[in-house]
Structure formats: C-alpha cells, structure tokens
C-alpha cells in the first residue's frame, strides 16, 4: 500500500465540490524520489492537483473537483510507471439528493389478510440508496397524543408499500401513520395520517347472478334484466351501499352507472336497456354511511335482454 486517498465526503449533493488528498508513503523506495501524482475520475485525467512534500517525507497531492456531476464514479490517484499508469488507491464517490418528502400516503384495511396496507409516492430519484420506513403508533384520541409505538414496517427493496399485520393493529382506535425516508444526505418525513383502520376498510365485491325465474313471477320485460347478488360473507355485517355498471358487449359504448343500491336490496330489476342485446354487468360496494374504500368491481356477469318489444316506459326500481 504505497498510496492512500481520503476525501472530504464520499457522498455529496449532485453538483457539489469534493476535495480529495492522496498521500504516498516515504518507504515506497522503488518510486521516483519526486513522483508526480496524477488524478483520474473514472477514465478521465483530472488536472489541478496541488502536490507537496510533507515534513515526514511523504508526498501529498490535494485536488478539488468543483462539481461532482456523476451519480457514481471512482476517483483514483496514480503515478506514471514506465509507459503505464500505476494506480495507488481509489475511492468510490457517490452524488445524489436527500430524499424528498414522501407524498400521497394512503392506507386500506384488508379484512381477508387482516392487515393494513399503506402505500406512498417516494418522490424523485435520489441516485443514492434510500430506505423507507412506515412508522406508526396507537392513539386514544386524534393522534395528538402518542400511545404505544408499533413495530416499524420496512418495505422490500424498491417497493413503496408496506403491510402492518393485525397483531399490531387496534380496530376502532386511531393510529398515527407516516413514512420516513432516509439516505446519506438526510431524512424526510411525510405528513402524518390519523386513521382508524376500519375507516379505510376495502370490502370484497358481491357475486352477481341472474335471478332464478320463479314460476309465479312475470318474466322480465323487454329491455330489462333481473339481477341478484350474493354479498361477501365476511363483510355481511358491515352496512354498505353498492353500485352497478353495465354496457352492451358489442360496440364502443362506455359504462353506465346505476346506484346507489343498498347492499340489502340483493335483487334488482334493471330496465331502460336495449332489447335483444347482450350486456356486461358488474357491481361494487363500499362501507356506508361510515367511511371506507370502494371494493374492486365484481367479476363480469353477461346477460341478454329479451326480444319482446316494450309496451311502456321503463325505469330503474327496487324490488
């Protein structure tokens, strides 16, 4: 080890200056007594090194790079050795930005996996290894007073979401939740959410079915469809409202929305449709009147309206 580089900081803001020093020990006797130390950033030679002999006989070269514009580069100090460059030492330099404040933090409670899933947008690329941690605590009130801390949730590399398992949750009690981003240049924190996991519950959609025609019931009128749905059993006791959407299978028509329907309707006659036409239908639900998230749309049901010509004006109505 004839040479050693030390730098003012191995990680800096992109575009900031960086100062490095390369010292060659005196006992490297095979070297030229007055060696000229050269600097190289990546493959490019860097002029401007100031070289001096120190009192102990070692040689030192100091260089200041006015702007480090590479997010990653190797800085090396070297000597001319015959016709080649002999590298004495090299260091990795990194440049980037401190983490921006994570934004758009949102959470949903998945009752099937029994976990609170939170996601966020990390902000612009920092060009540096940046860790994100979902932090939370339990709170009796509106999160002004902090209760028990909850174990940090650390997402897998590259992911901007994390799941807090049920054992760390208290339903019907507020939690303070925020994201902390950290890298070598700094730390930032998102604004804090204060929420009861049940207020961000996302239900599973009901299963749409065609209504089994009963012998005594009149067949559907032209342009009408008789529907029923089976509620998601695990969400049965949650008051909710639902909405249907439908569109003809052929053509470029957009979805038409029908609702709100109370989940308890369970049956519905949808009218005002084109006769003898195949339709695609879906349903989704949301906890209501308490807060919640809309479920995904249900798997599609495909039904055809009857061909008989309508005899009077049709409209939506509940059974």
């Amino acid at each position: 080890e004839c040479g050693h580089i030390s730098v003012s900081a191995p990680i800096v803001h992109l575009g900031d200056p960086i100062t490095a020093s390369c010292i060659i020990k005196q006992n490297c006797s095979h070297l030229d007594p007055e060696p000229q130390i050269l600097w190289r950033l990546g493959a490019e030679l860097q002029p401007g090194g100031r070289q001096q002999r120190l009192s102990d006989g070692t040689q030192e070269s100091i260089i200041t790079l006015p702007h480090l514009n590479h997010t990653q580069a190797f800085l090396s100090c070297a000597l001319n050795w015959g016709n080649s460059l002999q590298i004495l030492d090299q260091v990795e330099l990194r440049a980037g930005y401190p983490p921006a404040i994570p934004h758009n933090l949102s959470c949903l409670m998945n009752l099937t996996t029994s976990s609170l899933i939170c996601q966020w947008e990390p902000g612009p690329e920092t060009h540096l290894p940046t860790s994100f941690t979902l932090k939370s605590f339990k709170s009796r009130g509106n999160c002004q007073t902090q209760g028990d801390s909850i174990l940090d949730c650390v997402p897998k590399d590259g992911q901007s979401h994390c799941s807090i398992p049920r054992k760390h949750l208290l339903l019907y009690q507020n939690m303070g939740i925020w994201v902390q981003a950290e890298n070598a240049l700094g730390t930032s924190m998102s604004p804090q959410l204060c929420l009861d996991p049940m207020d961000v519950v996302k239900l599973e959609p009901p299963m749409l079915r065609t209504m089994d025609p009963s012998p005594e019931a009149a067949p559907p009128q032209a342009g009408c469809l008789q529907l029923s749905w089976e509620p998601w059993q695990a969400g049965l006791h949650i008051n909710q409202k639902c909405e249907l959407r439908h569109k003809p299978q052929r053509g470029e028509a957009s979805w038409a929305l029908v609702g709100p329907l109370p989940l308890e309707a369970l049956q519905y006659e949808l009218c005002g449709l084109l006769p003898a036409t195949a339709y695609t239908l879906q349903i989704r639900c949301i906890r209501w009147p308490l807060p919640g998230h809309w479920s995904d749309w249900s798997p599609s049901l495909e039904l055809r309206t009857t061909e008989r010509a309508p005899t009077h004006h049709h409209h939506h109505h509940h059974h």
Partner: antibody, heavy 118, light 107 residues
C-alpha cells in the same frame, strides 16, 4: 349506555308459538345488525338468527329455518323473534344481542327463558 | 358449516396461573374469531374480537392470537373473577358458530 331487554319468554306446549321482543336503547338501533342466540340448560351457545340494519337480510340456523322469523321495528327500537311449531329442543334461554361490524355479539341482553313442554 | 372445536373442555387452575384456551376452525376463517366469558346465570360478555382486539373495559391480562384455523385465548395471570366458561365464535360466514366452551375452575 347500551341496553337490551328481552321479554316474551315462558312455558309453551310443543307445536305452540311464542313471540320474543327485545327493546334496545342507548345506541342508534337502525344502524346495526341484531341477532338472537340461545342456550339450552347446561349447554353451550347456539346462534339462532340475525337481521340486517333495515331488515332486508335475515339468515337463520338450519335448526329453526322455516319455523322462526326474525324481524325488527326501527321506529320502536325493537327486535322480534316469532317462534312457531316449537319443539322440546327449543327450550333455552334466548339472548338478544347487537352485532359488531365483523360479526361479534356485544352487548347481550339478560336473556328470557323459553320452556317447551307438555 | 364451519365447526369450532375448543380445548380443553374444562381446566383447573390457581389464582396467578397463566391459562391458555385454544379454538380450532374446520376451515380458514382469517381473523374472524371472537371470545366470550360467561358466568353462571349471566349473559355472555365479549372479551376479544377479530382474533386479537381487546374489547373496551376488558383487563389487559386477556389476549387473543392466531389466524386461519388456530386461535388462542390467554389469561396471563388468572384472577378470582376469571373463573367462568369461555366460548369462541367464528363470524367469517353464516351460520355463525360457537365452540363448545371451556370451563375454568378453581384448583
């Protein structure tokens, strides 16, 4: 304070009918599912039936399906259980209870005893 | 229908003991498992809902754990007022079903 008070229990002959009532107070009755749970003497708990907040959904235990009818009157904050074709095995203390959103029972009434015997 | 199997059906313990009661569902019920305490001549009382949430007013010596098919109610240090019968109940799907009960008696 949430309170549930059952009434209407008593002695009835096999094949007879009885109507149980449960008067609720201390909460917005019309927003909650309600249910009936029974307990035969010296036995465990058995769910009988539940009813959704506005009365449109009414699941029943197989053992009472077709004989019992659950209903509610939200204007009177009252839950009912109409019991027909009663059998000896229906003898039990009948509890009315408020259901939580994820299907737990809390609180419970004090219970009313139904005895089916000749 | 989902069957709930509780064990043991009875146990004897002393004040201060740690007591564990288990409940097994015949199929997966996620976290839809609730625990009740019942004393003779009284209505049941909710202790734990959704597997691990302690109901308001219930002492912290009671705790619940588990998910899927296997669940546990633990009383960390048994108190004189805890001698009672304990029931589990699944609320994943109707019919709602209870375990057979576990009677906790004084040794």
């Amino acid at each position: 304070e949430v309170q549930l008070l059952e009434s209407g229990g008593g002695l009835v002959q096999p094949g007879g009918s009885l109507r149980l009532s449960c008067a609720a107070s201390g909460f917005t009755f019309s927003l909650y599912w309600m249910g009936w749970v029974r307990q035969a003497p010296g036995k465990g708990l058995e769910w009988v039936s539940s009813i959704s907040s506005s009365g449109g959904v009414t699941p029943y235990a197989d053992s009472v399906k077709g004989r019992f009818t659950i209903s509610r009157d939200n204007s009177k904050n009252t839950l009912y259980l109409q019991m027909n074709s009663l059998r000896a095995e229906d003898t039990a203390v009948y509890y009315c209870a408020k259901l939580g959103e994820l299907g737990w029972f809390d609180p419970w009434g004090q219970g009313t005893l139904v005895t089916v015997s000749s | 229908d989902i069957q709930m199997t509780q064990s043991p059906s009875s146990l004897s313990a002393s004040v201060g003991d740690r007591v564990t009661i288990t409940c097994r569902a015949s199929q997966g019920i996620s976290s839809y498992l609730n625990w009740y305490q019942q004393k003779p001549g009284k209505a049941p009382k909710l202790l734990i809902y959704y597997a691990s949430n302690l109901q308001n007013g219930v002492p912290s010596r009671f705790s619940g754990s588990g998910s899927g098919t296997d669940f546990t109610l633990t009383i960390s240090s048994l108190q004189p007022e805890d001698f009672a019968t304990y029931y589990c109940q699944q609320s994943y799907s109707t019919p709602l079903t209870f375990g057979g009960g576990t009677k906790v008696e004084i040794k």
